[in-house]
Interface confidence: low
């Protein structure tokens, strides 16, 4: 379409599409506007990656994808005079990014992190088929907090599996479980594929145990009353309380989704403490309690990772087998 | 469609009490936080507070720690902002909103004008 | 405390004109918990960016957000009939005071 074409013409390509990587894992694609585009027309630019997804038309002559690169990924984008999804693009131009080179049976394999106790990450690995006992693994990681890519020290291997942990504590009052932390796994000799892999801060978040501050028994309840682990506020918890009786020997699990300490039993305006009461317990004998807690779906979209189980606090006496 | 919808405007006089209410529908009342934002006539926004119905767990600013309670029933997917005793500074329009973690109010009541005058 | 400083306090332009209005924090914040609103006159403001440059839904996109640390702006890169109104940016706790975007 020349100078003079009507705005509904399809428009010629987007020029100069090019792609680049930031970071270890956001990838960017920016591009020019066509060549010779009608001159009554208000550019807009469809674009969507190679699998057809994540379609988008916007104005902007960019776009950007936190992805892993551990395979290609294509963007294609083309031109077009209106906001009409129904409107027909130009001929879409296509760029693509490969992964770094090398042998796919070298990289490593269920490269995967939590975060614990929204303190530090701990990610782990295992070696890929084809690499040598003795490697040496590097790990890089980057997350919006910190102003560059940054190296785990200290690689660590327990059993088939290789490690690394490093501090990321989470702030308060900011966007900082909004983004991702990016994470590449290769080799000081460069030998091995390099792997990625992006953690969203809104998951694999493991807490540590609550710490059972208190038991009592009131008009035949147990009350349990613990301080939950540091970094976390009682609404995005769950908890499982676990009482064992010597006596009859029972295991009871009770799911606890909602623990206030509203009764006045329970010692009151404690920061980061919560209650909960056990009924039906009998309290001339010994009764053994533990908790544990994981992130609820309120706060953090993975709820899979509880927390170690509490230490144990006993409540009551054991009978004699007499 | 989310909706939040404040009971009618008031005129009390200085020294009593008042409670307001706002509403939410279309969507999981107890996921999200309300705020509570005051404007007095011919000025701007002002953050007040804000209550996770979930739990109850309330915030103030500290300009209005200990001046309003803000406090929340979940069953009927209700929050509520109330004076124990009203004065004539607070009269204000005051509007209730729904409040993502993030921060940012993504939708608003319509507002419920306050008037204190003796 | 943190205080957020908008400017101009009012901003007089025609339609079809370009509008940068400024919010300045007395600290850095983090971007992600920036917004933008409008209000006209007699509504309810309405959410027009948050997390600094994302748009809310059903935002025209003339209206754009960017920013970090302590300065923060917001575009209108050309001004509807209907964009005439105040706006204020806010973090969490603090509202700014508003600029008001009149009709020149």
């Known amino acids: 379409g020349g100078g003079g074409a009507a705005p509904t013409e399809t428009q010629p390509p987007v020029t100069n599409l090019s792609v680049s990587v930031e970071n270890l894992c956001t990838v960017i694609w920016t591009w020019n506007p066509p060549e010779g585009a009608s001159p009554n027309c208000s550019l807009w630019y469809f674009s969507h990656f190679g699998d057809k997804q994540d379609k988008k038309l916007a104005p902007e002559t960019r776009r950007s994808k936190e992805v892993p690169l551990n395979e290609k990924i294509c963007l294609q984008v083309g031109s077009q005079c209106s906001t009409n999804e129904s409107e027909k693009p130009s001929i879409l131009v296509e760029k693509c990014i490969s992964p770094p080179e090398g042998d796919p049976e070298s990289a490593v394999t269920e490269l995967q992190c939590i975060w614990h106790n929204l303190s530090y990450m701990q990610c782990s690995w295992l070696p890929g088929r084809n690499t040598s006992p003795d490697t040496n693994y590097t790990l890089y990681y980057w997350h919006r907090s910190l102003e560059k890519i940054r190296q785990c020290e200290e690689i660590y291997k327990e059993g088939q599996y290789f490690g690394c942990s490093f501090d990321l504590t989470k702030v308060k009052d900011s966007s900082f479980e909004q983004h991702s932390v990016q994470i590449m796994v290769k080799d000081y000799a460069g030998k091995i594929k390099p792997s990625f892999n992006i953690v969203p801060l809104t998951s694999r978040v493991k807490p540590d145990p609550p710490h059972i501050k208190n038991l009592s028994f009131h008009n035949g309840d147990l009350h349990v009353q613990w301080e939950n682990p540091q970094n976390f506020i009682s609404r995005c918890l769950f908890y499982e309380v676990e009482v064992n009786n010597s006596q009859t020997e029972t295991h009871n699990v009770f799911s606890v989704q909602e623990a206030k300490c509203q009764n006045p039993e329970f010692e009151r305006n404690v920061e980061n403490t919560s209650c909960f009461m056990v009924p039906g317990v009998l309290p001339d004998t010994l009764n053994t309690v533990r908790i544990r807690v994981k992130t609820n779906k309120l706060c953090y979209e993975d709820d899979k990772l509880w927390s170690n189980w509490s230490q144990e606090m006993s409540i009551g006496k054991k009978r004699n087998s007499t | 469609e989310v909706q939040l919808v404040q009971s009618g405007a008031e005129v009390k006089k200085p020294g009593e009490s008042l409670k307001i209410s706002c509403k939410g529908s279309?969507?999981?009342?107890?996921?999200?936080?309300i705020g509570w934002v005051r404007q007095m006539p011919g000025k701007g926004l002002e953050w007040m507070g804000v209550?996770?119905?979930?739990?109850?767990?309330?915030r103030y600013s500290p300009s209005f720690q200990g001046q309003v309670t803000i406090s929340a029933d979940k069953s009927i997917s209700t929050a509520y902002l109330q004076w124990s005793s009203l004065k004539a500074s607070d009269t204000a329009m005051y509007y209730c909103?729904?409040?993502?973690?993030?921060?940012?109010?993504?939708?608003w009541g319509q507002g419920t004008l306050v008037t204190v005058s003796s | 405390e943190i205080v957020l400083t908008q400017s101009p306090g009012t901003l007089s332009l025609s339609p079809g004109e370009r509008a940068t209005l400024s919010c300045r924090a007395s600290q850095s914040i983090s971007s992600s918990y920036l917004a933008w609103y409008q209000q006209k006159p007699g509504q309810a403001p309405r959410l027009l960016i948050y997390?600094?440059?994302s748009r809310a839904t059903g935002i025209p996109d003339r209206f754009s957000g960017s920013g970090s640390g302590t300065d923060f702006t917001l575009t209108i890169s050309r001004l509807e009939p209907e964009d005439f109104a105040v706006y204020y940016c806010q973090q969490y706790e603090t509202f700014g005071q508003g600029t008001k975007v009149e009709i020149k």
């Open positions: 279309g969507y999981s009342f107890t996921s999200y936080w």
């Open positions: 209550i996770y119905p979930g739990d109850s767990y309330t």
């Open positions: 997390g600094a440059s």
């Open positions: 909103a729904r409040m993502p973690n993030w921060g940012s109010f993504d939708y």
